[in-house]
């Protein structure tokens, strides 16, 4: 669709005569008829296939024609067409004399024709005017013409309809060739697809307007490249949505069970060595001079009774000093000047000569120790109680007082709440410090797996095209993570193909 525009500029008829040579009375009141038609090698009469237009009387004899386009007038003359411009044309311009006010062809005598010109040729669509002048023996006509496209039509032959728009069916303006030019932030064949925030994850993010990044279920972050871990995951991470992969030292379904109490809580004091011995369980190995479950108690260096053979211990700033009884010497009174003849063995110990009588050794009865059997045995010195148990001397024997959750002679056994198989429907039992926890199989929940729930939403393999299925345990629904090139809640539809017409 376009318009052939003809701008009449000047008509010269100095003698004021008709084509027959007869003069006009009183002068030639001149108007024009224009016929636009398809290209003819020899322009002949016949239908004006591209259109016709007539002017009112524009002047008498010779006159210049005013450009009236700005005032809504008729110059340039408009010959609209509703077809593809063929690039060639034929044009007939007739100048007529109007004796009266009726300009209809049937109201005029045939000899009212002043002049007739006919041209033909090629004409491309464009803004530039082509200037032409046609001269006959008595008249001269100067004019220019061009073809331009109608509003919203584009291209070399005005055949491409394009209307700029900025709504949800497109965000574009039209290029000179009629192709769409997307507004900033939009893309796609019809510029209806927003360009998401730069870096927004191709599969896990999307947008409904430019520079936006909305996350699909299971993803978060400014660019939707961070997975959302399982609801309730405490000390864990994920690489795909709804996972809970435990950090080092943590365990359990929600990574909330402390498997590394030593590192996380540093319970041992005074430089003691900490050893993990189970969930929330540990043992402290104290440095010399300290005692207690957490080695929090400072010992006097004399508390370990370092002086032998009845020597008395004196604490000093830099250690201790043994005061030896008569007949003994050495740092710990360990050397004797006595022999068996001096009856050095106490508490019924029997004496044995050594080194040809120069020395001796006492063999002590049960419950006594020391080089002279002078010490009652403290069965707790070897710290035999595990898992923080407290050692108690009980006459000839010893016993361990265990912390909650432990039993056995040396508190070496973990009290198992799981022994009675409390988890129903094949649930797995986990001992905790203050009780137990059941990990339930798919389809069951509750503290003891006693509640039947819906089965794993991914069990039926609902995702297509090799998509990864994630079960959202909080809602018992599934989420499909589509591979590149597929969309849809089940990844069932390929993207990038042009939509097909329904007919």
């Amino acid at each position: 669709s376009g318009v052939f525009q003809l701008q009449l500029q000047e008509f010269i008829n100095e003698r004021g005569v008709l084509a027959s040579g007869r003069p006009c009375e009183p002068g030639c009141r001149t108007f024009f008829r224009v016929c636009l038609k398809h290209f003819q090698a020899v322009v002949s009469p016949g239908p004006c296939t591209f259109g016709t237009v007539s002017t009112p009387v524009l002047g008498t004899n010779s006159f210049a024609v005013r450009d009236d386009s700005s005032g809504g007038g008729r110059n340039p003359l408009q010959l609209p067409f509703n077809f593809t411009w063929p690039g060639t044309f034929s044009l007939i311009i007739e100048a007529w004399h109007a004796p009266g006010d009726d300009l209809r062809p049937e109201a005029l005598p045939p000899d009212a024709l002043i002049s007739k010109i006919a041209i033909q040729g090629s004409l491309a669509v464009g803004q530039n005017w082509l200037l032409d002048e046609q001269t006959s023996t008595l008249t001269r006509l100067r004019y220019s013409y061009r073809v331009i496209c109608s509003d919203n039509y584009y291209g070399d032959n005005c055949s491409r309809l394009c209307k700029k728009r900025n709504d949800h069916f497109g965000h574009y303006v039209c290029q000179p060739d009629g192709n769409l030019s997307c507004l900033p932030g939009w893309t796609g064949e019809y510029c209806q697809q927003p360009i998401c925030l730069s870096g927004c994850h191709e599969q896990n993010g999307y947008c409904s307007k430019p520079a936006e990044c909305l996350c699909r279920p299971g993803w978060q972050g400014r660019l939707c490249n961070e997975c959302i871990p399982h609801n309730g995951c405490r000390h864990g991470t994920c690489s795909t949505p709804w996972q809970c992969t435990c950090d080092e030292g943590w365990g359990g379904l929600f990574c909330d069970q402390d498997l590394n109490y030593c590192t996380h809580h540093s319970p041992c004091k005074n430089g003691a060595t900490c050893s993990n011995s189970g969930q929330r369980s540990y043992t402290c190995t104290c440095r010399p001079g300290y005692t207690g479950v957490d080695c929090e108690l400072e010992l006097s260096e004399c508390d370990s009774n370092p002086c032998r053979n009845g020597g008395s211990c004196k604490d000093q700033e830099d250690g201790y000093h043994c005061l030896c009884p008569p007949g003994y010497y050495g740092l710990h009174c360990e050397h004797s000047t006595l022999s068996c003849a001096d009856s050095p063995c106490f508490n019924g110990g029997s004496c044995r000569e050594r080194n040809q009588g120069a020395n001796y050794a006492c063999e002590c009865p049960p419950n006594f120790t020391g080089s002279n059997c002078e010490k009652k045995v403290d069965r707790c010195t070897s710290n035999p109680c595990a898992n923080g148990g407290q050692c108690l001397n009980r006459g000839p024997s010893r016993m361990c007082r265990c912390r909650p959750g432990f039993t056995g002679t040396y508190c070496e056994l973990h009290v198992s709440d799981c022994a009675r198989n409390p988890c129903a429907h094949g649930g797995t039992c986990h001992d905790l410090e203050n009780g137990l926890m059941c990990t339930c199989p798919a389809g069951f929940s509750g503290r003891r797996c006693e509640v039947r729930t819906s089965i794993d939403a991914c069990a039926s393999s609902p995702c297509f095209n090799r998509a990864t299925c994630y079960t959202d345990l909080s809602t018992d629904t599934f989420v499909c993570n589509c591979p590149y090139g597929f969309v849809g809640s089940r990844c069932e539809f390929p993207v990038g193909l042009p939509p097909s017409f329904p007919w």
């Epitope: 509003d151 919203n152 309809l161 209307k163 700029k164 728009r165 900025n166 709504d167 949800h168 069916f169 497109g170 796609g188 019809y190 209806q192 697809q193 999307y206 409904s208 307007k209 909305l214 969309v487 849809g488 809640s489 069932e492 539809f493 993207v495 042009p498 939509p499 017409f501 329904p502 007919w503």
Partner: antibody, heavy 121, light 106 residues
Framework: EVQLQESGPGLVKPSETLSLTCTVS??????????WGWIRQPPGKGLEWIGD???????YYNPSLKSRVTISVDTSKNQFSLKLSSVTAADTAVYYC?????????????WGQGTLVTVSS | SYELTQPPSVSVSPGQTASITCSGQ??????ASWYQQKPGQSPVLVIY???KRPSGIPERFSGSNSGDTATLTISGTQPMDEADYYC?????????FGYGTKVTVL
Amino acid sequence: EVQLQESGPGLVKPSETLSLTCTVSGGSISSSGYYWGWIRQPPGKGLEWIGDINYRGSTYYNPSLKSRVTISVDTSKNQFSLKLSSVTAADTAVYYCAREDVILRGGSDYWGQGTLVTVSS
Amino acid sequence: SYELTQPPSVSVSPGQTASITCSGQRLGDKYASWYQQKPGQSPVLVIYEDSKRPSGIPERFSGSNSGDTATLTISGTQPMDEADYYCQAWDRDTGVFGYGTKVTVL
């Protein structure tokens, strides 16, 4: 061949909420090339566009109804829904769902058969 | 709000041409669609993008749109063309329908 089918109650009491669902078969609602619209027609009157939605949930509403309208989409069920709150007798109409095609410059090439909703106590 | 105005009714003899107009401010700068609706039936798209026909729509239906007016023309009208006709355009993000024209084939 794409087909659309409206469903929902045919009678709603004044001041209550009108709820309708459109089920799409023979094609996917999850395409960037389409919007899914609701249009209504009071008895003996002309067509009135209510609003539309795409598969991502972007919605557009008629300004004259915007305060009362909610349109949502469920791609897993290939459905989209209309809720119109605080209804009056003036909301009595045949309600149509339709597919609006980007290629057709927003023209609606497929329509449901329509469902008459009467607002009356 | 944007309005599209149509004549309430148009009468035409069989075999003649019926022209239905649709007027709106600068409508020529928007894409016009036309729908045919017969009693008790859903609307059917007969023209989109001003002048294009969906497949299955007879060639006697044609459309044009310029200035403030879009026109649906039915050449060689047949009795089966008797129906209500609605024009439609988009004003920003809102769909707008004309008031409808009843075409009667005499």
